[in-house]
Amino acid sequence: QPDAINAPVTCCYNFTNRKISVQRLASYRRITSSKCPKEAVIFKTIVAKEICADPKQKWVQDSMDHLDKQTQTPKT
């Protein structure tokens, strides 16, 4: 059984067709196609809901950039 020791990688089979406001997003993670049927981005919202999104869509890329900048900026 391959990767039996590791936790299974969650996968996405469909993508949301609605743009999510960045104010609702807390974090994201990328899913690669070698482990799953589709390359995907999984956004976690501020209420801890996880949503699959298409990494090819511009709003998804913009949201990831926004979250990256948020993480890099120290909160004072």
Partner: nanobody, 125 residues
Framework: EVQLVESGGGLVQAGGSLRLSCAAS????????MGWFRQAPEKEREFVAA????????YYADSVKGRFTISRDNARNTVYLQMNSLKPEDTAVYYC??????????????????WGQGTQVTVSS
């Protein structure tokens, strides 16, 4: 607990065909995706194909599109991988795996957590 048993592997010449079977037991599979993965010596395990049990939607890795076909038989709780135009680079251990789907269409799944023991496919040139 989901149990998966693969069969149908073997030795075949390049250009030939094989059909792998994966018999599933121990659960209700309507909320599952069933997938095939492969692992060649010294390489990472890679996704090959998947089918959503409920609706029958299929997904393929680019490397097998047009050559491999995944299907399922609900009555037999079995998933098949028909492999045509086999190439030496398809040589690997092929694993069947089950993935519990999320509660909604856009929610991530639990991940491929249940695995079969694997079946060896060797394609000679």
């Amino acid at each position: 607990e989901v149990q998966l048993v693969e069969s149908g592997g073997g030795l075949v010449q390049a250009g030939g065909s094989l059909r792998l079977s994966c018999a599933a037991s121990g659960g209700t599979f309507s909320n599952y995706a069933m997938g095939w993965f492969r692992q060649a010596p010294e390489k990472e395990r890679e996704f090959v194909a998947a089918v959503i049990w409920r609706g029958g939607s299929t997904y393929y890795a680019d490397s097998v599109k047009g050559r491999f076909t995944i299907s399922r038989d609900n009555a037999r709780n079995t998933v098949y991988l028909q492999m045509n135009s086999l190439k030496p680079e398809d040589t690997a251990v092929y694993y069947c795996a089950a993935d519990l789907l999320g509660n909604s269409d856009y929610e991530p799944s639990s991940g491929f957590g249940s695995w079969g023991q694997g079946t060896q496919v060797t394609v000679s040139s």
